[in-house]
Interface confidence: medium
Amino acid sequence: SQVSQNCHNGSYEISVLMMGNSAFAEPLKNLEDAVNEGLEIVRGRLQNAGLNVTVNATFMYSDGLIHNSGDCRSSTCEGLDLLRKISNAQRMGCVLIGPSCTYSTFQMYLDTELSYPMISAGSFGLSCDYKETLTRLMSPARKLMYFLVNFWKTNDLPFKTYSWSTSYVYKNGTETEDCFWYLNALEASVSYFSHELGFKVVLRQDKEFQDILMDHNRKSNVIIMCGGPEFLYKLKGDRAVAEDIVIILVDLFNDQYFEDNVTAPDYMKNVLVLTLSPGNSLLNSSFSRNLSPTKRDFALAYLNGILLFGHMLKIFLENGENITTPKFAHAFRNLTFEGYDGPVTLDDWGDVDSTMVLLYTSVDTKKYKVLLTYDTHVNKTYPVDMSPTFTWKNSKLPNDITGRGPQ
């Protein structure tokens, strides 16, 4: 049945899906706070632009008794149930914010006539790439893949003089939603990462990972994994590690590395951490004070989703254009808008671009230091520390295959 959009005559509504199954175990109250803070900012911006309109959010909750696993495994049905609720109510906002689980986003995208934009804080998987009316405000797996391939190929920096073409990927199935899809993308045989590497093996057991650390016959010195330092410690403990092993720890949504008093534990010396450049003002913002460093990005994505809608609404209203058109639904891409914490850029497919940061542990100071940054928008690496105090021999990253000379 045709669902009418509450999206005209000076009144514009945002439908926010509040799903029990979520990419991050964040209390829904925190997400509500983020949305409400975003609404306040949007109203102010519209008023400053001389646009006297009303913008509100409707929070749509699913039945917690049915969908209560709390993770993304049962999210497909929950997403569709929420769509049914919208259909039954015959009422929809100008834009749908949520869901965050890849399964539910993919299914909802398939099962809806998408004449409205969908904004997601999550939906990390490759199956959500290149969707015409979907915008993703947290770095999707495709962006990670492009960084890794770029970094593997780099061979002209003082600290990385070898191109790499091999890797182990540790994936044991207990990962968080973001890690699950990041590693899934690296594992997929048809992905860009797999296509560009000559050798790649997925390690699924703790023992496999532990054995590789000192295995003289290993096929690669590089191991990619996803999670925080504690996750690595549980797995690696204080085991000895061969001197030319490099562990790449993907931990994008974790600001802790940048806090002043953080000292890197000894087990991190063979590790390069890939994370996102921290925001400027987020640590002090009212909505984020109660959030852990890993959750800030999730709540921020909800807030930025509201600001993105406000940005597009302002543009369309100023141009005298209709909001309930396919043009509006397809417009949430290839743009930069003023986010809560500075400019946010979306690529041609509506996926957020960001600055990824590769950190190493300084053997001198035991602090995390920035080795290089990577701009996902232009797929380009920018070195920061040209003389890193690495644990690796000659302060250079080793070759990815033991015993292989310069390429």
């Epitope: 770029n150 003082p158 400019p343 940054t373 797929n379 920018y382 040209m386």
Partner: antibody, heavy 122, light 110 residues
Framework: EVQLVESGGGLVQPGGSLRLSCAAS????????MHWVRQAPGKGLEWIGE????????NVHEKFKDRFTISVDKAKNSAYLQMNSLRAEDTAVYYC???????????????WGQGTLVTVSS | DIQLTQSPSSLSASVGDRVTITCRAS??????????LQWYQQKPGKAPKLLIY???KLASGVPSRFSGSGSGTDFTLTISSLQPEDFATYYC????????FGQGTKLEIK
Amino acid sequence: EVQLVESGGGLVQPGGSLRLSCAASGFTFSSYWMHWVRQAPGKGLEWIGEIKPSNELTNVHEKFKDRFTISVDKAKNSAYLQMNSLRAEDTAVYYCTRTIITTEGYWFFDVWGQGTLVTVSS
Amino acid sequence: DIQLTQSPSSLSASVGDRVTITCRASESVDYYGSSLLQWYQQKPGKAPKLLIYAASKLASGVPSRFSGSGSGTDFTLTISSLQPEDFATYYCQQTRKAYTFGQGTKLEIK
């Protein structure tokens, strides 16, 4: 001696195409980002795009993406700028330059070619 | 793109004068403790020549009468005592996000 030499400029009609070449010598070509920058008569400098010869990664400014393509031939130590659908406003001196990354991690254009003039006119 | 605005657009001065040109960026060009801003000199019919990189570092072979300062969004190029060969057009350039140039400052003999 580090040197960049552009060639291929000349007179072309509106709607026409032209391919500019930049021959590099005196340095390890594949390790540097190579750029094209243009300057219309009496105007300022405008960055067009860049290419990394080692992996042929390119970035072209949004303004030129539809019409201009940058490529390299590593065997010839040369970068190229293919310009299609040329307009009168593309009339300019086209320079080839490279980015150096210093040991402190700064990057900038340190070596430029002499430039080649492209005139688009009927 | 980061916009760079130079002032003045043109300027007349005499040999021996102290000259200052400013460049303002639309957003910060700072990057992990340094400023990714350069100054170039260009003479008619010639390619630009690098003078200053990272806001204040003198490029190889450039006379010490040239100096640069600033950080964030505001930068200055100073020529302490103008020489006849310094009359040219000067451009600032940022390499923080892609590459953009200022519109140029033409330095003429008074």
